[in-house]
């Protein structure tokens, strides 16, 4: 069910239309649902979920991560800097979400839904941001070669990459959700 169309909304016809913040909040929760389903399939299929963090850290994927300097943590919180980081991070994740598209058998539609919902989330956030000039869009050529490189990995590395992407994307969305609720 797309966000904003769940049974709660249907059951409460007097409810005000969703605000921009509520829509973003709901969208993130919807994507987190999708990630949860994809992680289930990944964990059932391989033992990657039991891998130690040290082993995972060896993988040289440059996945976006929140740091204190990004303005999303309570100490040094800066709404505009944080918003730019969230949008930039999501744009950087897009190539990894593209990589996930052919990685699932029973959850193929779920993988597509996560990808599409993330595009919608980016649009919502861009409307909220004042300083769009500060947002750097990843280079398409770099993304294309990264995608080719990831798809050329052996099976074990592809499983590891899939697991890492899902875990990191979940963490990034949770950090974003937390920060957005403070705005």
């Amino acid at each position: 069910v797309p966000p904003g169309e769940d049974s709660k909304d249907v059951a409460a016809p007097h409810r005000q239309p969703l605000t921009s913040s509520e829509r973003i909040d709901k969208q993130i929760r919807y994507i987190l649902d999708g990630i949860s389903a994809l992680r289930k399939e990944t964990c059932n299929k391989s033992n990657m979920c039991e891998s130690s963090k040290e082993a995972l850290a060896e993988n040289n994927l440059n996945l976006p991560k929140m740091a204190e300097k990004d303005g999303c943590f309570q100490s040094g919180f800066n709404e505009e800097t944080c918003l730019v980081k969230i949008i930039t991070g999501l744009l950087e994740f897009e190539v990894y979400l593209e990589y996930l598209q052919n990685r699932f058998e029973s959850s193929e539609e779920q993988a597509r839904a996560v990808q599409m919902s993330t595009k919608v989330l980016i649009q919502f956030l861009q409307k909220k941001a004042k300083n769009l000039d500060a947002i750097t869009t990843p280079d398409p050529t770099t993304n294309a070669s990264l995608l080719t490189k990831l798809q050329a990995q052996n099976q074990w590395l592809q499983d590891m990459t899939t697991h890492l992407i899902l875990r990191s994307f979940k963490e990034f969305l949770q950090s974003s959700l937390r920060a957005l609720r403070q705005m």
Partner: antibody
């Protein structure tokens, strides 16, 4: 099985610093979406949230007590420490540590320690 | 800060009765509202999270509802062990805030 236990002094003199330790098991504070908070309750009164620390070391404090509080974590030891400076008789309360852990960050405390009474 | 107000501050009922208590938030918190039950001398226990989701192990006679600024906790077919104080909590944003509590006497 998730458990948390508070430890620290039961008696503190005015102006002294209170140091409370929350030792936990059954979960890891390096898992995304997981956090540990401190809540206190003066005798016969309501619950009052004090501080919170997340898996990624993001920290939040009660605005009215922020200048007196420090929360830290030691992930390898499975411990969270709260320090509260300049203690006063009005700080007499049962101090609880509690865990929050869900994908959507509902900030709900699903497991609590037994509490420690500090006078 | 988001203020949480609970009503009534106390109520008494008989075993088998049903009761409803309310919680207001000073601004919209969507469905980020949690309910706890505390017996004297014990730690609080999570009953309901996200306004209407029952925590695992909580009997189905408990029901949470509401959204935005108005929330209710209903207990049907009261049992002796339901006595104690019920607290609501803002789970939307920091600082986290609790209501003053509703004391239930059976």
């Amino acid at each position: 099985q998730v458990t948390l236990k508070e430890s620290g002094p039961t008696l503190v003199k005015p102006t002294q610093t209170l140091t409370l330790t929350c030792s936990f098991s059954g979960f890891s504070l390096s898992t995304s979406g997981v956090g540990v908070g401190w809540v206190r309750q003066p005798p016969g009164k309501a619950l009052e949230w004090l501080a919170f620390i997340w898996w990624d070391d993001d920290k939040y404090y009660s605005p009215s007590l922020e200048s007196r509080l420090t929360i830290t974590k030691d992930t390898s030891k499975n411990q969270v420490v709260l320090t509260m400076t300049n203690m006063d008789p009005v700080d007499t309360a049962t101090y609880y540590c509690a865990r929050s852990a869900d994908d959507y960050l509902y900030y709900s405390f699903d497991t609590w320690g037994q509490g420690t009474l500090v006078t | 800060d988001i203020q949480m107000t609970q009503s009534p501050s106390s109520l008494s009922a008989f075993v088998g009765d049903g009761v409803t208590m309310t919680c207001w938030a000073s601004q919209s918190i969507n469905d980020y509202l949690n309910w706890y039950h505390q017996r004297p001398g014990e730690a609080p226990e999570l009953l309901v999270f996200a306004a209407s989701n029952l925590q695992i192990g909580v009997p189905s006679r408990f029901r949470g509802s509401g959204s935005e600024t108005y929330f209710t906790l209903t207990i049907n077919s009261l049992q002796p062990e339901d006595s104690g104080t019920y607290f609501c909590q803002n789970g939307h944003s920091f600082p986290l805030t609790f209501g003053g509590g509703t004391k239930l006497e059976i």
